[in-house]
């Protein structure tokens, strides 16, 4: 796997061990926690990420409106499993054998159960609405300015192909990012939408997965962008399975 | 060249802890994972753990988690494995070993375990 | 964990006789195994890397195939010198695990 050659280390994830002794003498990057070798010239995927984490020595008619089949991750943190290939495993479980099932991004779609709970496939996370509050200025970004800033950073920062940004929406002081990307869009060697969310989750944080490189310094036409708030909202291609009694 | 040096043996009584040096040479000790390897007589090999030196980040095989604890000593480029509360099943060759393929092996220490 | 089946678990040949050892993955570990010979009273060593990669000083006779769940380890022509334990290993994630071996006999 690709890794920074001449002193062996991951630009693109701080959060591994990197050694000469991969394939051919060629310096291999080992996630945290799971000891997969990651390829560094891309992301890392987020149940890597968050597995590393866990084993690592925290409105107006212009802006969508999250489905009601829109989800949020609200259980923050768990150690998860992952599979062969870094991906979620569609069931979850914790040291207390209470299961549930999670969507390609890692998010609670089910009621939590017992042992006995089948989540019969990964469901995929076609659309990420990530919902963000900046910091007052003295006026209003320009909205194409913003635009151009925000799909610049996706596809530069974050390598994800600049058709998957659907949208930039704009309303004074919140700003919406679309991400769309369909299982027969995704393309072999495409970034995952989830992937990109999560690395820019942890930046606007303060918490960069990056190595070496200093934070997220958003600006907008040379005006900061400084962001007080964020909420991520996660759409299934299969609606989500909740009982009423979660709803109400 | 390359090498990891074991003591040849060591006897340890029932219960006292005991800890097994690796010292390398040759390489840079900091840059390579190092393995330990465990073998009971007649038997196969089973993977303990590893550590890499330039921050001891340690993982374990589950198996040996309450028994094995792995350290370094980067002054002198020695590798230690110590056993908590050694019993007879612990009496086994016990090899360090380097990298992911493991391409240099100590020549290992048999540990008894005996009163 | 991956667990790793090596079959079989004695090997018998004639010298000048091409064997092979078979190592079978529980999961796909792409090329992330590693073979071992040990002779008696022996440490391991390693005869080749990640399922092909020949290693210096070991004879060209040995040679290693596969990816994914399935390898091979080659032995061209045996040797009496042969005599031994060959292990897989993969390094694929943590816990490395080993396969339980395969005894190589010389008739």
């Known amino acids: 796997h690709t890794a920074a050659q001449d002193n062996c280390t991951c630009p693109t994830n701080k959060m591994t061990v990197c050694s000469p002794d991969g394939p051919g003498g060629r310096c291999q990057c080992r996630a945290l926690g799971s000891g997969m070798a990651v390829d560094c010239s891309t992301l890392t995927s987020k149940c890597l990420l968050l597995k590393a984490r866990m084993s690592a020595p925290k409105n107006a008619r212009t802006l969508v409106r999250p489905s009601e089949h829109a989800l949020v991750d609200n259980d923050g943190l768990y150690d998860p499993d992952c599979d062969p290939e870094g991906r979620f495993k569609a069931r979850q479980c914790n040291q207390t054998s209470v299961c549930w099932c999670v969507n390609s991004v890692g998010v609670r779609r089910t009621d939590k159960g017992d042992l006995s709970l089948r989540c019969d496939e990964l469901v995929r996370t076609h659309h990420i609405l990530i919902d963000l509050r900046h910091r007052p200025t003295a006026g209003a970004f320009n909205h194409s300015d913003l635009d151009a800033e925000l799909r610049r950073l996706f596809r530069e920062r974050y390598r994800l192909h600049p058709k998957f940004v659907a949208a930039v929406h704009y309303e004074q002081p919140t700003i919406q990012i679309e991400l769309r990307q369909n299982t027969s869009q995704k393309a072999a060697g495409d970034v995952d939408i989830g992937d990109a969310a999560y690395y820019f989750e942890r930046d606007i944080k303060g918490e960069s997965l990056f190595q070496g490189r200093g934070g997220l310094d958003l600006r907008v036409r040379g005006e900061p962008l400084q962001v007080e708030r964020t909420l991520i909202y996660y759409l299934d291609e299969i609606p989500p399975k909740f009982s009423m009694k979660r709803l109400t | 060249q390359v090498q990891l040096q074991q003591p040849g043996a060591e006897l340890v009584r029932p219960g006292a802890s005991v800890r097994l040096s690796c010292k390398s040479s040759?390489?840079?000790?900091?840059?390579?994972?190092i393995n330990w390897v465990k073998q009971r007589p007649g038997q196969g090999l089973e993977w303990i753990g590893n550590?890499?030196?330039?921050?001891?980040?340690?993982n374990y095989n589950q198996k040996f988690r309450d028994k094995a604890t792995l350290t370094v000593d980067k002054s002198s480029s020695t590798a230690y494995l110590q056993l908590s509360s050694p019993t007879s099943d612990d009496s086994a060759v016990y090899y360090c070993?380097?990298?992911?393929?493991?391409?240099?092996w100590g020549q290992g220490t048999a540990l008894t375990v005996s009163s | 964990d991956i667990l790793l089946t090596q079959s079989p678990a004695i090997l018998s040949v004639s010298p000048g006789e091409r064997v092979s050892f078979s190592c079978r993955a529980s999961?796909?570990?792409?090329?992330?195994i590693h073979w071992y010979q040990q002779r008696t009273n022996g440490s391991p060593r390693l005869l080749i890397s990640?399922?092909?990669e020949s290693i210096s000083g070991i004879p060209s006779r040995f040679s290693g195939s596969g990816s994914g769940t399935d390898f091979t380890l080659i032995i061209n022509s045996v040797e009496s010198e042969d005599i031994a334990d060959y292990y897989c290993?993969?390094?694929?994630?943590?816990?490395?695990?080993f396969g339980s071996g395969t005894k190589l006999e010389v008739k």
């Open positions: 550590i890499f030196p330039s921050h001891s980040y340690t």
């Open positions: 290993q993969h390094s694929y994630s943590w816990p490395f695990t």
């Open positions: 040759g390489y840079t000790f900091t840059s390579y994972w």
């Open positions: 070993t380097r990298g992911s393929g493991f391409d240099y």
């Open positions: 999961q796909n570990i792409g090329t992330s």
């Open positions: 990640y399922a092909s």
